[in-house]
């Protein structure tokens, strides 16, 4: 069983293979020095049927280099940065995993790319294992929350409770949304 | 962090076979390959070939291919690695490695296993 | 097979100095490069990948660049624990390691 040639690459190169490339066989992609690699480097041949060879992923590309481009701090709720950090640049790539109770949906790596978004896929969500979701609290009299999506929330997620200047907070801060469905807490008060 | 912990020494007899098992633990087993390098005494590193378990795909040196088996148990997050037709050049510390994804590079290693091929 | 070749194969340096070890490979490998650090009695530890990039909890002293078939891993400033033997490692094509330069006291 073995894969056909790999994606071609506009602005870049491929590692070297030889032919017929093995299931297993990976092969990487780089760029040219004033281009940007969007998309994940490393190609996989695999097989899905045991009878024909495929390549595990689309290729990457490689864009010229925009040393304006900036993209915004990538949420993704339920979920966390393992790798990456502000300011994003062009190219740079940022990973996220999932907090416990959660699963992954879509591809754990995003690139800067020039048009100042995110991509070459969509951010990956997380997912709650919990079919039970938190009802949505009530905003508070002289305060704010903030939380991480609107409406119904699921477990392992939390509500953060602020009070406007002059108030005094009175309760729990960090209301949790735990696995039961049930909110860790009452929401707070802001009192004079 | 994760953390490969390697089967103990073994002593085996020219002909013979070993089987060496390497068990992971912190992080997916899935999400990761497993490669097995070898040292012989005073020598340096030799890649003998590695597997994917998720995909229960096994590569190997060729040097090695024929006489070496790599195989993955997922339900156990266990790797292992058998050298059949053994030789006294055989004598050495064999590494299990794990690479994230496919990158390429081994950010853990295992503590080692002496295999001693002697009559 | 991708052939990496390691020199000096032996290098005396004082602590304090600067320590520059090379690699070559036998072919072009871009930036497909790692450096692993081992000490007697104990398995490799990964210090550079990516030719250039430090891996998680390894001191600034440690750096590495080159590409294609030149590489160089220097360290800035020798402490006692960095004594030992280092090994380049291909990953262009498949795996291949270099035969490694051991790092002494002079």
């Known amino acids: 069983i073995s894969c056909g040639s790999p994606p071609p690459i506009l602005n870049g190169r491929i590692s070297y293979y030889s032919t017929p490339i093995a299931v297993g066989t990976v092969i990487r992609y780089s760029c040219s020095g004033t281009f940007r690699l969007i998309g994940e480097k490393s190609l996989l041949c695999i097989t899905k049927d045991k009878v024909d060879g495929t390549w595990d992923k689309p290729a990457p590309k490689c864009e010229y280099f925009n040393k304006y481009s900036s993209c915004p701090e990538p949420i993704v709720p339920g979920g966390y940065k393992i790798r990456g950090s502000t300011p994003y640049r062009h190219g740079d790539s940022v990973t996220f995993a999932c907090k416990t109770n959660f699963s992954m949906n879509g591809n754990k790596s995003v690139w800067c790319q020039a048009n100042n978004m995110w991509g070459p896929t969509r951010l990956p969500t997380c997912v709650s294992v919990f079919p039970l979701e938190c009802p949505a609290l009530p905003m508070i009299h002289n305060g704010h929350h903030t939380s991480e999506n609107v409406g119904s929330i699921a477990p392992g997620l939390s509500v953060t409770y602020s009070c406007e200047s002059g108030y005094l907070l009175v309760g729990e801060k960090i209301i949790n949304c735990l696995s039961s469905g049930k909110w860790s807490a009452v929401p707070p008060t802001c009192e004079e | 962090q994760v953390q490969l912990v390697q089967s103990g020494a073994e002593v085996k007899k020219p002909g013979s076979s070993v089987k060496v098992s390497c068990k992971a633990s912190g992080g997916t087993f899935s999400s990761y390959a497993i490669s097995w390098v070898r040292q012989a005494p005073g020598q340096g590193l030799e890649w003998m070939g590695r597997i994917i378990p998720i995909l229960g795909i096994a590569n190997y040196a060729q040097k090695f291919q024929g006489r070496v088996t790599i195989t993955a148990d997922k339900s156990t997050s266990t790797a292992y690695m058998e050298l059949s037709s053994l030789r006294s050049e055989d004598t050495a510390v064999y590494y299990c490695?794990?690479?994230?994804?496919?990158?390429?590079?081994?950010?853990?290693w295992g503590q080692g296993t002496l295999v001693t091929v002697s009559s | 097979d991708i052939v990496m070749t390691q020199s000096p194969a032996t290098l005396s340096v004082s602590p304090g100095e600067r320590a520059t070890l090379s690699c070559r490979a036998g072919q072009s490998i871009s930036s497909y490069l790692a450096w692993y650090q081992q000490k007697p009695g104990q398995a490799p530890r990964l210090l550079i990948y990516?030719?250039?990039s430090r891996a998680t909890g390894i001191p600034a002293r440690f750096s590495g660049s080159g590409s294609g078939t030149e590489f160089t891993l220097t360290i800035s400033s020798l402490q006692s624990e960095d004594f030992a033997v280092y090994y380049c490692q291909q990953y262009e094509y498949w795996y291949s390691f270099g035969q490694g330069t051991k790092l002494e006291i002079k």
């Open positions: 490695a794990r690479e994230e994804d496919i990158s390429g590079y081994y950010q853990d």
């Open positions: 990516d030719a250039s």
